[in-house]
């Protein structure tokens, strides 16, 4: 049946309504709207924001509209102490300083609380020593440098370049390194695209262009203070000292003018290879400290930020569902920025606000979607995802027994080449059907549909003539709904073309540049990739509250599930002597893995042959097809990763913004031939895998036929 | 119109102190990096002082380290130049200039001058 026939209601307030209803022109004016001044997370102006944004999806339409606050660590700059970096010389005398605020941008020269550049949860502190380059700062940038340069990290204060992984994965590989300070600086061979202009002339990061962001290692936790549980009024919070994630040495971020006069000084080893050296004209020597001339003068740090507990705002709206209220499809993104937020995340949240008022006209006509939708507009995602973690906490019993799916709503751009999509494998078929039935919005597609645009230009690697999806990571707010509570979960935007534009996320990603201007110039000006965003998020909210049978396809999952034994076992593999030795088999995974194809294809026939007009039946096959995903969860979680749950996705323990497959595993092997204790190390492979083949095929079990 | 307007100027005995000023127009002061450049009768022009736009750094010539002091009020989009011990080698026709780098670190080119102010140095 469709979807309208099952909501008793006229066939006019279909899927096709819902879309024809998304307008360009109002995703333009809500982003204007939301980036006139900033709303950090904890400010009156983000308060004041989201009574706004309650006020207006009310007058969509919405059932209820609803604030939830909680009390959560957040990490502010002095606003009478600022933070800097110096070169100092011997007498101590400082002979430069790194800049105190970035250049404001044209026409807000006078907008006052634009929060300066600053790395947030860094503790105070004033180190000072030699530097010590380290590229990006990932896991294989130490290993070069201890194993293979023999260069000691020990009480030097490093300075790392961002891109290619979570800042917050560079700290902690710093502080396990012994660096007593970090520096993170923008290289132009990172966030300079050539031939593009910098701002207000064009996209590029200019030299006083600055990244924030919060440097944790929070692995899911959410709160510092209130690990698996809300901050609200009655929690019990740890002690600063015994917060989750926080980092233990200071930390400051710098644009390419500044770090251009800490590296051109750099004496020491010579950087490795071409893959260390950036686009400044500097050296790029690893150190550590200074070159001849300069051998005396050190580097120092002066961080005077504070961390305290503050309030925050979700706002969370509700649209009543009409046949299964008691199931959840949600729709959700955060509302604060680090300042204006031109693309993070106010582009995400106008996409959603446009979709909320889709919604409601179709409300307004009478219309209801068969499953509950709930729309959510979190805060302080930017300082560790707090809003919808907390929620989630608040709400996870709840969450656990109804949740059917999250999508994710944040930047709906990061370029403007193609659609990129990350999601469970329950909803490829869903996204692949959706696209079908959209319009292209690229140039040279006219008439042609999204799914032809996206899968010539972003192609999989192994099917050819589909599209490529990837697996979900973390950096988020879906992060809680699906590595710790098992929700099926999805995101999408458009993208740049990530085979000639090398550089990582952005080159204007949380500095004071993200403006309304840059988008409205340089990246969406008739908006129409936004609208394509709107209408690929909210189609997939439209079919997954909307159709009689779950669009979920558990045949999928059997195909990862595959291909992620062979390649973990690929790995396992280049240890043929040490498998042998200590009995390591995989022979038991692969098996579930089998079992689970057999089955999920057995179910696929029964969901396609079953009665759909016998609601009890009906219910039943859905719920099957809600719970698969909360199959696969742990209860115990990963080691020393309790709230990453999920046994066949986490975020990479190396880099928070990738996935992982087969996690458990996968870190068990990494790097086991550095293991003091190598029969232990492969004990515990052994274990990971007996984990994930019991997971697979209790996960398979749960679509057997129930009696 | 892009323009810079000095003041200030005038005639001052040996010791004495002077503040110029310089009024910004045009463009917001608070994204550039300012000079102060001075026109000695006869000889060549001489760089004397550099501010970053956030006032983090300051560079000084050698003749007038100690002695001179470069400031800037953002929200007023002005620049100073604080004179104090002045010498009969001081007097000259002082500009303000913009350097040509938003943002820049370090002192570079100048984009745009103003018309100079006069200070004379006599007892």
């Known amino acids: 049946k469709s979807s309208s026939e099952a909501t008793n209601i006229t066939p006019k307030h279909n899927m096709k309504a819902f879309l024809d209803e998304l307008k360009a022109e109002n995703i333009k004016k809500f982003l204007h709207n939301f980036t006139q001044i900033p709303h950090l997370a904890g400010t009156e102006q983000n308060f004041q924001l989201a009574k706004q944004i309650q006020s207006q999806w009310k007058e969509f339409g919405l059932d209820s509209v609803e604030l939830t606050h909680y009390d959560v660590l957040l990490s502010y700059p002095n606003k009478t102490h600022p933070n800097y970096i110096s070169i100092i010389n011997e007498d101590g005398n400082e002979i430069f300083n790194t800049s105190l605020f970035e250049p404001p941008p044209a026409g807000y020269e006078n907008v006052s609380d634009i929060v300066p550049p600053f790395s947030a949860f860094s503790p105070q502190g004033m180190p000072e020593g030699d530097l010590v380059y380290v590229n990006y700062a990932r896991t294989e940038d130490f290993f070069k440098l201890e194993r293979d340069m023999k260069i000691n990290c020990s009480g030097k204060i490093v300075i790392a370049r961002y891109g290619k992984v979570f800042r917050g994965n560079k700290v902690k590989n710093a502080q396990l390194a012994g660096a007593t300070g970090v520096i993170l600086y923008s290289d132009p061979a990172d966030y300079f695209a050539p031939g593009v202009k910098s701002y207000p002339d064009g996209w590029n990061l200019p030299g006083g262009g600055v990244q924030r962001g919060n440097i944790l290692n929070l692995n899911g936790a959410g709160d510092p203070l209130t690990p698996g549980y809300p901050a609200n009024e009655y929690a019990y919070r740890r002690g600063i000292a015994e917060a989750v994630g926080l980092p233990s040495i200071p930390v400051h971020p710098i644009g390419y003018y500044d770090a251009q006069k800490l590296l051109e000084k750099m004496g020491g080893s010579a950087s490795p290879d071409s893959s260390w050296r950036g686009s400044l004209k500097v050296p790029y020597n690893v150190g550590p400290g200074f070159t001849g001339n300069f051998s005396t003068q050190k580097v120092k740090m002066h961080i005077h930020s504070t961390s305290e507990v503050t309030r925050i705002y979700n706002v969370i709206g509700t649209l009543r569902g009409a046949v299964e209220p008691d199931r959840y499809v949600i729709l959700g993104g955060h509302r604060d920025s680090w300042v204006f937020g031109g693309i993070d995340p106010q582009s995400g949240a106008a996409v959603v606000h446009e979709i909320v008022r889709s919604f409601g006209t179709l409300k307004k006509e009478g219309w209801r979607p068969r499953r509950t939708i709930l729309f959510a507009s979190w805060d302080a995602e930017e300082f560790g995802l707090l809003g919808s973690t907390e929620w989630a906490e608040e709400n996870s019993r709840l969450l656990q027994e109804r949740g059917v799916a999250y999508i994710n709503a944040d930047s709906s751009i990061e370029g403007n080449y193609t659609l990129r999509v990350d999601c469970t494998p329950l909803m490829y078929s869903l996204v692949y059907n959706l696209t079908k039935e959209l319009e292209s919005p690229d140039e040279g597609f006219e008439g042609k549909s999204l799914y032809e645009s996206w899968t010539k230009k972003s192609p999989s690697p192994e099917f050819s003539g589909m599209p490529r999806i990837s697996k979900l990571g973390s950096g988020n707010d879906f992060e809680v709904f699906f590595q710790r509570l098992g929700i099926a979960s999805g995101r999408a935007r458009y993208t740049k073309n990530w085979e000639t534009n090398k550089f990582s996320s952005y080159p204007l990603y949380h500095s004071v540049y993200e403006t309304y201007e840059l988008v409205e110039k340089f990246y969406d000006p008739m908006f129409k990739y936004h609208l394509t965003v709107a209408q690929v998020r909210g189609g997939m909210v439209f079919e997954l509250a909307n159709s009689v049978v779950l669009p979920f396809d558990c045949r999928d999952y059997a195909v990862v599930l595959r291909k992620y034994a062979d390649k973990i076992y690929n790995i396992s593999m280049k240890h043929p002597q040490e498998m042998k030795t200590y009995s390591v088999s995989f022979d038991s995974l692969f098996s579930a893995v089998k079992n689970f194809t057999e089955i999920a294809s057995k179910f696929s026939e029964r969901l396609r042959d079953f009665d759909k007009s016998n609601p009890i039946l009906l219910r039943m096959m859905n719920d099957q097809l809600m719970f698969l995903e909360r199959a696969f969860i742990d209860p115990l979680g990963l080691p020393d990763r309790p709230f990453y749950r999920h046994v066949i996705y986490a975020p990479s323990s190396h880099n928070k913004y990738a996935g992982e497959s087969f996690p458990g595993i996968y870190d068990a092997l990494f790097d086991i031939e550095s293991k003091v204790d190598p029969s232990q190390a492969w004990g515990e492979v052994k274990r990971q895998i007996s984990i994930a083949t019991f997971t697979v095929q209790a996960a398979a079990e749960t679509l057997s036929e129930v009696a | 119109e892009v323009q810079l307007v000095e003041s200030g100027g005038g005639v001052v005995q040996p010791g004495r102190s002077l503040r110029l000023s310089c009024a910004a127009s045009g463009f917001p002061l608070i994204s550039y990096g300012m000079h102060w450049v001075r026109q000695a009768p006869g000889k060549g022009l001489e760089w004397v002082a550099f501010m970053t736009y956030d006032g983090s750094n300051r560079y000084y010539a050698d003749s007038v380290k100690g002695r001179f002091t470069i400031s800037r009020d953002n929200s007023k989009n002005t620049l100073y130049l604080q004179m104090n011990s002045l010498r009969d080698e001081d007097t000259a026709l002082y500009y303000c200039?913009?350097?040509?780098?938003?943002?820049?670190?370090?002192?570079?080119?100048?984009?745009?001058w103003g018309q100079g102010t006069m200070v004379t140095v006599s007892s």
């Open positions: 200039a913009r350097d040509r780098i938003v943002g820049g670190r370090v002192p570079d080119a100048f984009d745009i």
